[in-house]
Amino acid sequence: NKILVKQSPMLVAYDNAVNLSCKYSYNLFSREFRASLHKGLDSAVEVCVVYGNYSQQLQVYSKTGFNCDGKLGNESVTFYLQNLYVNQTDIYFCKIEVMYPPPYLDNEKSNGTIIHVKGKHLCPSPLFPGPSKP
């Protein structure tokens, strides 16, 4: 039995930040779970992890340097990513694992969300092109 995940097909990060909501066909209330967000078609980069274990407080971390936070709903986790770069435009997949109570559950792979990171638009004069954001 697999948990189904719904994500927006596309989001635009205008100010180098975005909220990506992962909606699950499962109620996370009073569960021990690990929700994560993965970057790339092969989900090779684990962007952010939100860990919940009954307590009121979520543990949020990234092993790959992303600035992130997480908010928990009954059947959702919203990832808030900050300080994104234009070259981090990619497809992002939500993943969920429920560790307790048994049985262990995880999700069917979702369709993912394309996050398009828009650069901050500067208006340099043609004679003096200003610094471009990486």
């Epitope: 939100v50 407080q57 979520l58 543990q59 949020v60 971390y61 600035n67 936070d69 770069y85």
Partner: antibody, heavy 120, light 107 residues
Amino acid sequence: EVQLVESGGGLVQPGGSLRLSCAASGFTFSTYWMHWVRQTPGKGLVWVSRINSDGSSASFADSVRGRFTISRDNAKNTLYLYMNSLRAEDTAIYYCARADSSTWSHFDYWGQGTLVTVSS
Amino acid sequence: EIVLTQSPATLSLSPGEGATLSCRASQSVSSYLAWFQQKRGQAPRLLIYDASNRATGIPARFSGSGSGTDFTLTISSLEPEDFAVYYCQQRSNWPPTFGQGTKVEIK
């Protein structure tokens, strides 16, 4: 005037526990992320932990994850750091700091610090 | 994590002279860089945020510049109260990290 005042530091044996407090005033505490940063002569300034504005999420440096917890009481305008299984390398001055604009932002105000010494 | 390297470690100058402090990041931090001043026995004080913005109440003699990996803090004319240790800090990547500091001392 923004003020942050830490307390709770002291001498503790390895393996012991300590609770640090940070009393905030002069701003709307409940709308800001708060952080703990520590300083040692050897390693300089090192970020330790953060908590979001309503206390629902937290992050920790790898060196303290699983040993330290962070919480806040917005009614009392107070931030806490619970330190368990303390090690000699946790010896430092611990500062609480406010993050401007509420999230992963720069630290615009700091407390005066409280010294934690872990030694037998 | 991102490593910030500050240079020089110590700067010996006289009041009235200008000071130039450098901070280099191991990878791009865009403009997400801050500078702090710390005097002995005191907490760090925010001087500059987002590479070039002066914090509230900071005198105009302090200025910051740079983006990507190379940043500079400039003190145009040192006042006696400016002799202290200066740290850079990035918030581009998690976790936030600090440089090891540059001490500005009286020659």
